[in-house]
């Protein structure tokens, strides 16, 4: 267990950056920061959780930007950002620092937020080391910060996995070695016997290997199947693996902020009330009370004090804190070439000519729901429709009465007569056929087209 600490030194335009604020003349505002820690050095998806923890800073002092003045370093929130970690410090991690700007003017729906800068660093860092300084550029902005990881007693080591006992917790008892001087600090860890389990063993003298409760063997590798020592306190015996009575780690209740203490093998554990974290419940974590959900997001707390909050985002926003506006037009919701407009509260589609509907889904030129009059049939094609009209009718929807003889359909001087079912041609002498198209030869045989395959001359023939 331990705490990752981040100190922001300055945030402002970098060298060669914008000479004046890119957010000028927009009224009073203030800065705050969000830090997110992810384990490992691999590039993680932006939406992957901050598995090592996250923290939100307090809001900084209110400032009003001057339109013509050069943008100075902006006023920062006070204090460290602290991200408690319960388990081992991984050593390699991704650090994401977001700088947010909160506008305090008259905003619809309350304050408005905008993400000014986000820096991501993949780093190796040992716990217990000195502060590491960094300068990062994000667009025109420059962020200067320092960070470190520190263990919380009794955890020590570069990964905060070794446990030691503060000397002041030592009490002499019959048969135990003389007490070390009373000092509220850990003894320098002695070099244990080679191979002594880092997890289940410890030593108070160089070369020894003493086991935590539940483990035995020369290197503390063997689990104790049945322990008759449960409930006893003190360092374990090298011979039996049992604990010698001693002081309780919960004596004096080391848990702050109303945390309750329970003993664990060789140490203690604090059960913290909601909103507090850390080995001794001394670190306040991000909870719904911190207002971590932006843009109208609703903060939904977990079912128990240890579970993280989640933000349910209003339509149009996403991200773990509802900080990202959804580009809803990127999903191309408008069909048939319609133009998408994201109005914030709703999407609008501006449809091309010939299309309609909320998503331009209705083709005004198609046959669906469109009837051709007077027995005509609708034929689709090429994004448009046309009516194939019954004889005697014409026009776009077959609503116009047509004169079937207007196009002079009878060939070779034939006379055209309009009839209820169409037209009839009265052919001039020497011609025959529905349209008087076939000349009659002198021998009385008409010049009909060749018979289709399979028909013998003289069979009855029908022609359209």
């Amino acid at each position: 267990a331990g705490v990752f600490e981040l100190q922001i030194h300055s945030f402002g335009p970098g060298p060669g950056g914008a000479p004046r604020s890119p957010y000028s003349a927009r009224g009073p505002c203030r800065l705050f920061f969000r830090v997110c820690l992810k384990p490992g050095l691999s590039e993680e998806a932006a939406e992957s959780p901050c598995a090592l923890g996250a923290a939100l800073s307090a809001r900084g002092p209110v400032y009003t930007e001057q339109p013509e003045a050069p943008a100075p370093d902006l006023p920062l929130p006070n204090g460290l950002l602290q991200v408690p970690f319960r388990d081992a410090w991984p050593g390699t991690f991704s650090l994401i620092i977001e700088t947010w700007r909160e506008e305090l003017g008259d905003q619809i729906g309350g304050p408005a937020w905008s993400l000014l800068a986000r820096v991501t660093r993949r780093r190796r860092l040992a716990a217990g080391g000195p502060w590491a300084g960094d300068i990062q550029r994000a667009g025109a902005w420059e962020l200067r910060f320092s960070y470190r990881a520190r263990c919380e007693l009794p955890a020590v080591g570069t990964a905060c996995t070794r446990l030691c006992r503060p000397r002041s917790a030592s009490r002499c008892g019959p048969g135990l070695r003389p007490c070390a001087p009373l000092e509220d600090e850990c003894e320098a860890p002695p070099v244990c016997r080679a191979g002594c389990s880092l997890e289940h063993g410890f030593c108070e003298q160089p070369g020894e290997c003493r086991c935590l409760e539940g483990w035995t063997g020369p290197l503390c590798m063997v689990p104790v199947s049945t322990s008759s020592c449960l409930g006893l306190r003190g360092p374990s015996s090298t011979t039996t693996g049992c604990l010698v009575p001693g002081p309780g780690p919960c004596d004096g209740n080391p848990c702050a902020n109303g945390g309750s203490c329970s003993e664990t093998p060789g140490s203690f554990e604090c059960t913290c009330p909601r909103g507090f974290y850390g080995l001794r419940c001394e670190v306040s974590g991000v909870t719904c009370a911190d207002g971590p959900c932006f843009n109208g997001g609703l903060c939904v707390g977990g079912a128990d004090p240890d579970s993280a909050y989640i933000c349910h985002c209003p339509p149009g926003f996403q991200g773990s804190n509802c900080e990202k506006r959804v580009d809803r037009c990127s999903l191309q919701p408008c069909r048939n070439g319609g133009l998408c407009l994201d109005l914030g509260h709703a999407l609008r589609c501006r449809c091309r000519a010939g299309f309609a509907g909320p998503r331009c889904e209705h083709d005004l030129n198609d046959c669906a729901g469109r009837a051709c009059a007077n027995g005509g049939t609708c034929v689709e094609g090429g994004g448009a429709h046309r009516c194939s009209c019954a004889l005697g009718f014409g026009g776009r929807d077959c609503r116009e009465r047509a004169d079937p003889c207007a196009a002079r359909p009878c060939a070779h001087g034939g006379r055209c007569y309009a009839h209820f079912s169409g037209l009839v041609c009265a052919c001039a002498p020497g011609y025959m056929g529905a349209r008087c198209e076939f000349p009659v030869h002198p021998d009385g045989v008409s010049a009909l087209p060749a018979a289709p395959p399979g028909l013998r001359p003289g069979d009855p023939q029908r022609y359209p």
Epitope: I108, G109, G110, G291, C293, G296, C299, P314, P315, P358
Partner: antibody, heavy 118, light 108 residues
Framework: QVQLQESGPGLVKPSETLSLTCTVS????????WSWIRQPPGKGLEWIGY???????NYNPSLKSRVTISLDTSKNQFSLKLSSVTAADTAVYYC????????????WGQGTLVTVSS | EIVLTQSPGTLSLSPGERATLSCRAS???????LAWYQQKPGQAPRLLIY???SRATGIPDRFSGSGSGTDFTLTISRLEPEDFAVYYC?????????FGGGTKVEIK
């Protein structure tokens, strides 16, 4: 203009399940959160829960063990089921749409009175 | 959960007077995520204000909201006859969503 209409039995027996449906007209059920709120006679408003068109739900912890809200996008409807009802569940039940700028209620149904009695 | 306490329980005023309704939260309401509703007998509530101070569509400008943190106010600058009703506040920053107990504005 979005309109919401609650429907369902006005009388439910104790220990049974109360079932109500809200039909949304004048707009799509997609892209919004939809909620149920109730008001016992002569008393104040109590939020029951909501559902997002994607299926996300959130319920009032005081009712969570008994509440289910579901969605039927094809019918533009969402529903409330409240199990093991008692006389204390007698109330006017409202369905409502949650706003675009936060979790307030911008459109409401006219409400339906459900009486729990044997 | 965040408990909202409205005061007074009943406000007796005459048309034309100014009404000031209070809503106090048991803990800070994040980012002024607070709404006000009006409810008349036999009707559903109607949204008046969201974001503590933004008027909903179609709401007359005699209605105004203010406040932040734990203290919020709804003001009706000049009461019209149709304004006599029950008014509720609601916070929507932290789940569960909660309403105040209501303030009844009645004709004196």
């Amino acid at each position: 203009q979005v309109q919401l209409q609650e429907s369902g039995p006005g009388l439910v027996k104790p220990s049974e399940t109360l079932s109500l449906t809200c039909t949304v007209s004048g707009g799509s059920i997609n892209s919004y959160y939809w909620s149920w709120i109730r008001q016992p006679p002569g008393k104040g408003l109590e939020w029951i829960g909501y559902i997002f068109y994607s299926g996300i739900t959130n319920y009032n912890p005081s009712l969570k063990s008994r509440v289910t809200i579901s969605l039927d996008t094809s019918k533009n409807q969402f529903s409330l089921k409240l199990s093991s009802v008692t006389a204390a569940d007698t109330a006017v039940y409202y369905c409502a749409r949650i706003g675009v700028a936060g979790f307030y209620f911008d459109y409401w149904g006219q409400g339906t009175l459900v009486t729990v009695s044997s | 959960e965040i408990v909202l306490t409205q005061s007074p329980g009943t406000l007796s005023l005459s048309p034309g007077e100014r009404a000031t309704l209070s809503c106090r939260a048991s803990q800070s309401v994040s980012s002024s995520y607070l709404a006000w509703y009006q409810q008349k007998p036999g009707q559903a509530p109607r949204l008046l204000i969201y974001g503590a101070s933004s008027r909903a569509t179609g709401i007359p400008d005699r209605f105004s909201g203010s406040g932040s943190g734990t203290d919020f106010t709804l003001t009706i600058s000049r009461l019209e006859p149709e304004d006599f009703a029950v008014y509720y506040c609601q916070q929507y920053g932290t789940s569960p969503l909660t309403f105040g107990g209501g303030t009844k504005v009645e004709i004196k």
